[in-house]
Amino acid sequence: ESLGWDIAELQLNHTGPQQDPRLYWQGGPALGRSFLRGPELDKGQLRIRRDGIYMVHIQVTLAICSSTSTSRHHHPTTLAVGICSPASRSISLLRLSFHQGCTIASQRLTPLARGDTLCTNLTGTLLPSRNTDETFFGVQWVRP
Amino acid sequence: ESLGWDIAELQLNHTGPQQDPRLYWQGGPALGRSFLRGPELDKGQLRIRRDGIYMVHIQVTLAICSSTSTSRHHHPTTLAVGICSPASRSISLLRLSFHQGCTIASQRLTPLARGDTLCTNLTGTLLPSRNTDETFFGVQWVRP
Amino acid sequence: ESLGWDIAELQLNHTGPQQDPRLYWQGGPALGRSFLRGPELDKGQLRIRRDGIYMVHIQVTLAICSSTSTSRHHHPTTLAVGICSPASRSISLLRLSFHQGCTIASQRLTPLARGDTLCTNLTGTLLPSRNTDETFFGVQWVRP
């Protein structure tokens, strides 16, 4: 552990109420194949406990979805991963829209610091699938 | 090697017969940029030889494809990556549908154990491209 | 650094002139969350300085884009990542088309050698977004 191999893979717990775009995550072997080794969850949001460069990855699949359902909504459904606290470090790290698709998946390298809390904001009226092979979110510490 | 840096990147060899949705993979420097360093192939399926948390990634591009060809099929074309043997550990790890797109790509962290065989099941009537820059599948050991 | 943890995450600087399909990248803390630790930029193209197997990842979002704008162009918009020099090692590593989507994102493991220069070619008439959370390109050394 002293090598700093902090790592987490989370599954969706629930969405927030209408005015809260955040997805709420959960992790742990009792829940399936999700886990937290280093990072921790704070009210369903992922908090970093070790400084470093991380690979952040996410896949979100919409629960009720056809090519038409994503395109016919006035407000496009968009997923953004960002640092939401501390406020001084707030920034969007990764953003994707669902256009005519029903799944987004991406990954990126980014520096994160101890105490950074990552939020995953899903805007739009469509809700995500909670199937653990369709919607997941994870981070992996890769170097100091 | 004692660090456990097991890693593999595979290219598509062929698809199975009609009632076998599995993709069959191949790897090795003689074939191009694919390789197996630790994991092994068993009849075209990837078998894990070291316990740990792995980053699993895949990209599959459909061979004869336009936005209409993926959307007009009654049965949507879907790609699922899972542990298919041993049967006691059988589970879907990663699943994506092609909706109106012609390529899916994703990745996730997951615990895998020695002897786990990963299968990549492509359901639907469309066939994958064998171009090595369009269709590939890989795993990377990241920590114990 | 002797461990060989070469890593880079780049943001889009600009596109080339009409007959140059390459995207030109930039990186460094002064620019935001991009960085180069080992690899270097040569006229906006990423050059590898250490042999090894790398995880290459990319996300590109088109700037003015709707599902119709990507589908109505005669020549589909395509993104290819490859080794463009030295010429003897020129090869396409990763290729995706935008079909009816506005973002592509993928990743793969590939062996790279010191001196390899990676090019990211965007063909078509649509331009990429320069938002740093929508378009980025990175590599991570993962093992010798």
Partner: antibody, heavy 119, light 107 residues
Framework: QIQLVQSGSELKKPGASVKVSCKAS????????MNWVRQAPGQGLEWMGW????????TYADGFTGRFVFSLDTSASTAYLQISSLKAEDTAVYFC????????????WGQGTLVTVSS | DIQMTQSPSSLSASVGDRVTITCQAS??????LNWYQQKPGKAPKLLIY???RLHAGVPSRFSGSGSGTDYTFTISSLQPEDIATYFC?????????FGQGTKLEIK
């Protein structure tokens, strides 16, 4: 504790207008959207739409556009439903409802306001 | 819009009986299914959300199950205070839609 208290019953003539209020207490009003649900006599529940209490943006379900208007007085922690050009078929109990932690799951309801439209 | 078809529309049972109500969605709603109880002249009250999660303070005799398009609400042992109308509601996308209700009476 969290409460949604609605205005009293209304008897209106066809063509008139009515404004139903829903006063919230026990929480920060602008943190949660307010939904409106209609129940005609002896009938089921019909979701009418909702209003974002932070931005004021309303969303109306099909069939509830035009004559139906959602509005707010954030200083009074109150949401309003106004119905104009009333018709006999608007006779119903109107409820305001609010979520807690989960999207589209209504933990809190007003007691309901009966609007009767009759000549 | 997603249609929710609830059955039966009414049922009569005795105290202590096991009571089952079903709700069918016109398409897969991915377990985003909630159940409410409404007594005459009162507002609906949340009982179960996300198919099977019991809302705080709701007695354990109430339960829910199902997946895809088919969902079930069960009262394991009917009590006199359970006399009410029960509604299912899909919560996967707008517009939100409810079943037409099941009126439960005591024999």
């Amino acid at each position: 504790q969290i409460q949604l208290v609605q205005s009293g019953s209304e008897l209106k003539k066809p063509g008139a207008s009515v404004k139903v209020s829903c006063k919230a207490s026990g929480y920060t009003f602008t943190n949660y959207g307010m939904n409106w649900v209609r129940q005609a006599p002896g009938q089921g529940l019909e979701w009418m739409g909702w209003i974002n209490t932070y931005t004021g943006e309303p969303t109306y379900a099909d069939g509830f556009t035009g004559r139906f208007v959602f509005s707010l007085d954030t200083s009074a922690s109150t949401a309003y439903l106004q119905i104009s050009s009333l018709k006999a078929e608007d006779t119903a109990v109107y409820f305001c409802a609010r979520e807690e932690d989960y999207r589209y799951v209504f933990n809190y309801w007003g007691q309901g306001t009966l609007v009767t439209v009759s000549s | 819009d997603i249609q929710m078809t609830q059955s039966p529309s009414s049922l009569s049972a005795s105290v202590g009986d096991r009571v089952t109500i079903t709700c069918q969605a016109s398409q897969d709603i991915s377990n985003y299914l909630n159940w409410y109880q409404q007594k005459p002249g009162k507002a609906p009250k949340l009982l179960i959300y996300d198919t099977s999660r019991l809302h705080a303070g709701v007695p354990s005799r109430f339960s829910g199950s199902g997946s895809g398009t088919d969902y079930t609400f069960t009262i394991s042992s009917l009590q006199p205070e359970d006399i009410a109308t029960y509604f299912c509601q899909q919560g996967v996308t707008l517009p939100l839609t409810f079943g037409q209700g099941t009126k439960l009476e005591i024999k």
